[in-house]
Interface confidence: medium
């Protein structure tokens, strides 16, 4: 009963729950991760234990600084949900529930070029499509490394596609398009496409 | 049985290079953080440094440049590449495994049997 | 980095005799603290951890104590295969390192 009053005793705010925290909350198969749960209370010396489901996976200790685990997420069922408990003696508090978005990365896109020519203008429309990674996905087209479009999202397995019109160039101009999904820092690139100046019958694209 | 086994240890000249190897059976290593350290003839442990589940290396201050720890958990194997080695380095090397699951903040409750890296001319 | 001092280094004791170690960090380590044998030619064995929690299959005659700075290896009853090496280790770990302390050994000889 003495263990009871004790954890009794401790007002909430002295003791309340624990946060369980990862930097990286989308995530890939196989991707490492680091999870951090941390308690308000940097005095205490608290035993930190990370549970996924009602799977115990480790436990440590802790005074001041956040308990650090460090997990490979390979399967979907690794997702989650987490909670990580604080113990103090025979007081012990949960954190709220953490999940893991697993996304499959997107593959490298491929860039079609199509291209109506008239006299004085090229018409020139790009389609770009990741046959496979998790929608959304967002695609940008890129002329000589710099972006000519926003942003454009698209929730299915259908191509973006961006048009534009120029005056007939004299010189040659390189398109590629990016596709990304919500996985951070995780972006592919289509292989570059060259058109070439006018001039001859240089238009390889071109619908005559 | 939870098992760790050293390799790799024998007899080299100061400014050599060794790669020991611990070789770990009946438990997956992916779970672990797993330490090398050592102890000069007669004298006291010396932590060398951890690796964690993640592949997080830390290393104790004189360790730094010169040792170097690896894993291969498809192998089940943990590698310490040791190199400009000097005299003073002659010591049973260990491998150990931190007993609590996906930490570095844990203590050894298994370890291996040990291997004597000598250096000398 | 923290460093462990272990007293004494080395002791002599008889049979049934009730012998304590010392170990002292060089900082606040809370419970962070675990303590080892280890007998001449072999790996150390894990005996105590958290500084007070006895592994499982270490004879309830070794017991440890203490937190912070001060921690302390009781054997209450001496045996014959208690004669050996006693290290007392700190773990410690942060968010940018990690690292683990051994202190220098005790030494429990026959009297």
């Known amino acids: 009963r003495k263990a009871v009053l004790d954890c009794e005793a401790m007002k909430t705010n002295e003791f309340p729950s624990p946060c369980l925290d990862s930097k990286t909350k989308v995530v890939m198969k196989g991707q490492n991760v680091s999870m951090f749960c941390s308690h308000k209370n940097k005095s205490l010396q608290i035993t930190y234990s990370l549970f996924r489901r009602k799977t115990h996976l480790g436990t440590q200790d802790g005074k001041g600084e956040p308990a650090i685990f460090n997990l490979s997420i390979t399967e979907a069922h690794e997702s989650g949900p987490y909670k990580c408990k604080a113990q103090v003696t025979s007081c012990s508090k949960y954190s709220r529930d953490f999940s893991f978005t697993i996304v499959d990365p997107v593959t490298s896109p491929v860039l079609n070029i199509m291209v109506i020519q008239t006299e004085t203008d090229r018409h020139i429309t790009l389609h770009c499509l990741s046959v496979n990674g998790s929608l959304p996905i967002n695609y940008t087209f890129f002329e000589n490394h710099v972006a000519i479009s926003p942003a454009i999202s698209k929730y299915d397995r259908e191509p973006a596609e961006f048009n534009l019109t120029k005056k007939n160039p004299g010189e040659e101009e390189e398109y590629r398009c990016e596709a990304k999904n919500r996985l951070p820092n995780y972006a592919t690139y289509s292989h570059p496409v060259t058109m070439p100046s006018t001039g001859g019958d240089s238009c390889p694209f071109c619908l005559k | 049985e939870v098992q760790l086994v050293e390799s790799g240890g024998g007899l080299v000249q100061p400014g050599g290079s060794l790669r020991l190897s611990c070789a770990a059976s009946?438990?997956?290593?992916?779970?672990?953080?797993m330490s090398w350290v050592r102890q000069a003839p007669g004298k006291c442990l010396e932590w060398i440094g951890t690796?964690?589940?993640?592949?997080?290396?830390y290393y104790a201050s004189w360790a730094k440049g010169r040792f170097t720890i690896s894993r291969d958990n498809s192998k089940n194997t943990v590698y310490l590449q040791m190199n400009s080695l000097r005299a003073e380095d002659t010591a049973v090397y260990y491998c150990a495994r931190l007993s609590e699951l996906y930490t570095t903040n844990s203590y050894y409750s298994r370890w291996g049997q040990g291997t004597l890296v000598t250096v000398s001319s | 980095d923290i460093q462990m001092t272990q007293s004494p280094s080395s002791l002599s004791a008889s049979v049934g005799d009730r012998v304590t170690i010392t170990c002292q960090a060089s900082?606040?380590?809370?419970?962070?603290l675990a303590w080892y044998q280890q007998k001449p030619g072999k790996a150390p064995k894990l005996l105590i951890y958290?500084?007070?929690t006895l592994e499982s299959g270490v004879p309830s005659r070794f017991s440890g104590s203490g937190s912070g700075t001060d921690f302390t290896l009781t054997i209450s009853s001496l045996q014959p295969e208690d004669f050996a090496t006693y290290y007392c280790q700190s773990y410690h770990y942060s968010s940018s390192s990690s690292y683990a302390a051994f202190g220098q050994g005790t030494k429990v000889e026959i009297k």
């Open positions: 958290r500084a007070s």
């Open positions: 009946g438990f997956s290593l992916s779970s672990h953080a």
């Open positions: 900082e606040s380590i809370g419970s962070l």
């Open positions: 690796i964690s589940t993640i592949d997080t290396t």
